[in-house]
Interface confidence: low
């Protein structure tokens, strides 16, 4: 059952999983430029059995330019235009510390793909919270959050963090000590 | 889930205008790239026009391009394709279709890649 909702916004938090549990579809996202094959899948989907668990399909990009349509691209601010990968390393870097039975791992990245992930997750997936470079985690509970059933409808529970002041972020589960990036880190992940 | 209903079909004139509405259900709608899609006698599927679900890009098969032009209202949970100087050519039936994820930014002329369709509409263009 895939959740209805987004993880909850945490001011100055990013979150992510650590891994995917079955069923989880990542978009096939390409960057400006390019688009899926022809023939490929719109989604990558986790799935497999007790012992196993991997991504079904393969994310494949081609470049855009010969095609017998007309593209009308509304300008975006530059900000935009140029997302930050940051995210997208750190999560492949936690997700080689994780081998959890039914869930996936972060997928390796596809040539030309998008910088940013779309997730589309089910019920009983956690993610985690951390605050961005900058802010200090102050927590009343657990830094995470899970997707739930509640009578007929998914949900996502509260995480019990606040980010606040300026000082070194907070780790995921599991993460090393980050070096120090003047970028940052992205204030959110596009997931669903 | 998405269920889609079109409307505004019917018998023009060539050089007319016509507007199709293309109502949706479903309270996930407006994540949804939306498309039309039109089929003439004895001839395939073909694309005609798609708009992103969060309505930032728009793209036209070339043979409407200039005449046609694709909108959405996610408060309402429309779409809409407004047809002006139609062509005998443009006789088809015509098809709304959302596509086969939410939130994707890939706007596809590919007919199996959208997995919810309408009933259709039927436009016909005298000459």
């Known amino acids: 059952e895939l959740c209805d909702d987004d993880p909850p916004k945490i001011t100055h938090a990013t979150f992510k999983a650590v891994a995917y549990k079955e069923g989880t579809m990542l978009n096939c996202e390409c960057k400006r430029g390019f688009r899926r094959i022809k023939s490929g899948s719109p989604y990558m989907l986790c799935t497999g059995n007790s012992s196993h668990s991997s991504w079904d399909n393969q994310c494949q990009c081609t470049s855009s330019a010969a095609r017998n349509t007309t593209k009308q691209v509304t300008p975006q601010p530059e900000e935009q235009k140029e997302r930050k990968t940051t995210e997208m390393q750190s999560q492949m870097q936690l997700a080689d510390q994780v081998s959890l039975p039914g869930h996936c791992r972060e997928p390796p990245p596809w040539e030309n793909e998008a910088t940013e992930r779309i997730y589309h997750f089910v019920v009983g997936q956690t993610v985690y919270y951390q605050c961005v470079q900058g802010y200090r985690a102050l927590h009343r509970g657990p830094a995470e959050s899970v997707c739930k059933m509640t009578h007929g409808k998914t949900r996502w529970t509260q995480p019990q963090l606040i980010c606040t002041g300026e000082t070194e972020p907070s780790q995921f589960p599991g993460e090393e000590e980050p070096q120090a990036s003047p970028d940052g880190l992205p204030e959110s992940e596009t997931s669903r | 889930q998405v269920q889609l209903q079109e409307s505004g079909g019917g018998l023009v004139q060539a050089g007319g205008s016509l507007r199709l509405s293309c109502a949706a259900s479903?309270?996930?709608?407006?994540?949804?790239?939306m498309g039309w899609f039109r089929q003439a006698p004895g001839k395939e599927r073909e694309f005609v026009a798609v708009?992103?679900?969060?309505?930032?890009?728009?793209e036209y098969t070339d043979s409407v391009k200039g005449r046609f032009t694709i909108s959405r209202d996610n408060d309402k949970n429309m779409v809409y394709l407004q047809m002006n100087s139609l062509k005998p050519e443009d006789t088809a039936v015509y098809y709304c279709?959302?596509?086969?994820?939410?939130?994707?930014?890939?706007?596809?002329?590919?007919?199996?890649?959208?997995?919810?369709w309408g009933q259709g509409t039927q436009v016909t263009v005298s000459s």
């Open positions: 708009i992103s679900w969060n309505v930032d890009n728009t």
């Open positions: 479903g309270r996930t709608f407006s994540s949804y790239a």
């Open positions: 279709a959302a596509d086969s994820i939410p939130l994707s930014s890939d706007m596809s002329p590919t007919a199996t890649e959208y997995g919810y």
